[in-house]
Interface confidence: low
């Protein structure tokens, strides 16, 4: 099937980084500057993504792959492929419609992005608060007072939560 297709369609021989140029009798021409083709057999090359403004270039465009952007310092990526950049806040804050705001009492944010989350309720697991929470840090739960014996201590910090609306890059 592949061989038949090649005989019928000369464009299928054009490798990535080139395009099948109808204006030149279907010759494989290299992609022009600032464009790319990531697969073979393409009749056009795609325009490279430009990382402008608050975006900065993480990976340059090549003839076979698009540029990749991330965000300038003070901003972080949102969406698949870093489609948007959003302002960072300080730890202990969250971004609202009115800008960065401190976490309310009883909540924390240990990152520069995302929302403030409630402190862990140690008593739900029958544990006691070993270290109090702050705006930047969750509480640390320890064994219940009854379990504490001299020299024994088991402190398990809570697992970090993933960010809302943030797709892994």
């Amino acid at each position: 099937f592949e061989r038949t297709r090649s005989l019928q369609d000369p464009c299928s021989n054009c490798p990535a980084g080139t395009f099948c140029d109808n204006n030149r009798n279907q010759i494989c021409s290299p992609c022009p500057p600032n464009s790319f083709s990531s697969a073979g057999g393409q009749r056009t090359c795609d325009i490279c993504r430009q990382c402008k403004g608050v975006f900065r270039t993480r990976k340059e465009c090549s003839s076979t792959s698009n540029a990749e952007c991330d965000c300038t310092p003070g901003f972080h990526c949102l969406g698949a492929g870093c489609s948007m950049c959003e302002q960072d806040c300080k730890q202990g804050q969250e971004l609202t419609k009115k800008g960065c705001k401190d976490c309310c009492f009883g909540t924390f944010n240990d990152q520069k992005r995302g929302i403030c989350r409630p402190w862990t309720n140690c008593s739900l697991d029958g544990k006691s608060v070993l270290v109090n929470g702050t705006k930047e840090r969750d509480v640390v739960c320890g064994p219940s007072p009854a379990d504490l014996s001299p020299g024994a201590s088991s402190v398990t910090p809570p697992a970090p939560a993933r960010e809302p609306g943030h797709s892994p890059q």
């Epitope: 993504r49 430009q50 402008k52 403004g53 608050v54 975006f55 952007c69 949102l78 969406g79 698949a80 492929g81 870093c82 489609s83 948007m84 959003e86 302002q87 969250e94 971004l95 609202t96 419609k97 992005r113 995302g114 929302i115 989350r117 939560a161 960010e163 809302p164 609306g165 943030h166 797709s167």
Partner: antibody
Framework: EVQLVESGGGLVQPGGSLRLSCAAS??????????VSWIRQAPGKGLEWIGI????????NYAQKFQGRVTISRDNSKNTLYLQLNSLRAEDTAVYYC??????????????WGQGTLVTVSS | DIQLTQSPSSLSASVGDRVTITCRAS??????VAWYQQKPGKAPKLLIY???NLETGVPSRFSGSGSGTDFTLTISSLQPEDFATYYC?????????FGQGTKVEIK
């Protein structure tokens, strides 16, 4: 006052393409922290998100379902966005909305919507 | 994609009634949920964002609550203009998704 006005809907043949416009007023498409999404609603059905553009930089993201046959673009000088959808089938019959998207704190919510434009795919 | 399931699909109520609509997410979405109202032939209108924040200009009889996977929209005293379809939407994970809608009809 923020306003979004869609246009370009109508009857389209199966296999054809549509190009819808969304003219924005009352805010600039180059404002940081604002993006615009296209969302559709088939007759009597729920809302379905198609994709988003950050007009400030032209970056787009599309729902997996539409990947490969959708393009969202913008012309900031006209404060207008566009939705191009190719290889149309009967299931693409819907009212198409553009909606402003205020993203902050990692959340995407649609605070202003256009009135919608109806696209009917039929032979 | 994260699925949102609303219940009930429709309900009949009278003016002055307290109405509660629930939205359940297929996985934890923290508080990244919004509620919209849609009237026939009109575009949806944002009522609540971040699960419990009232959008500017929305009457205080609307309220939202919940976190994790279970969310509620409450209309404390139903008014004639509240008869409409209501949708929840999550923005915790990509892509944003909507519930199937709850139609509030006049009894």
């Amino acid at each position: 006052e923020v306003q979004l006005v869609e246009s370009g809907g109508g009857l389209v043949q199966p296999g054809g393409s549509l190009r819808l416009s969304c003219a924005a007023s009352g805010f600039s498409l180059s404002t940081s922290g604002v993006a615009v999404s296209w969302i559709r609603q088939a007759p009597g059905k729920g809302l379905e998100w198609i994709g988003i553009i950050n007009p400030n930089f032209g970056d787009t993201n599309y729902a997996q379902k539409f990947q490969g046959r959708v393009t969202i673009s913008r012309d900031n000088s006209k404060n207008t966005l566009y939705l191009q959808l190719n290889s149309l089938r009967a299931e693409d019959t819907a009212v198409y909305y553009c909606a402003r998207d205020e993203y902050y704190g990692g959340s995407y919510y649609f605070d202003y919507w256009g009135q919608g434009t109806l696209v009917t795919v039929s032979s | 994609d994260i699925q949102l399931t609303q219940s009930p699909s429709s309900l009949s109520a009278s003016v002055g009634d307290r109405v509660t609509i629930t939205c359940r997410a297929s996985q934890d979405v923290r508080t990244a949920v919004a509620w919209y109202q849609q009237k026939p032939g009109k575009a949806p209108k944002l009522l609540i964002y971040d699960a419990s924040n009232l959008e500017t200009g929305v009457p205080s009889r609307f309220s939202g609550s919940g976190s994790g996977t279970d969310f509620t929209l409450t209309i404390s005293s139903l008014q004639p203009e509240d008869f409409a379809t209501y949708y929840c939407q999550q923005s915790y994970d990509w892509p944003p998704t909507f519930g199937q809608g709850t139609k509030v009809e006049i009894k």
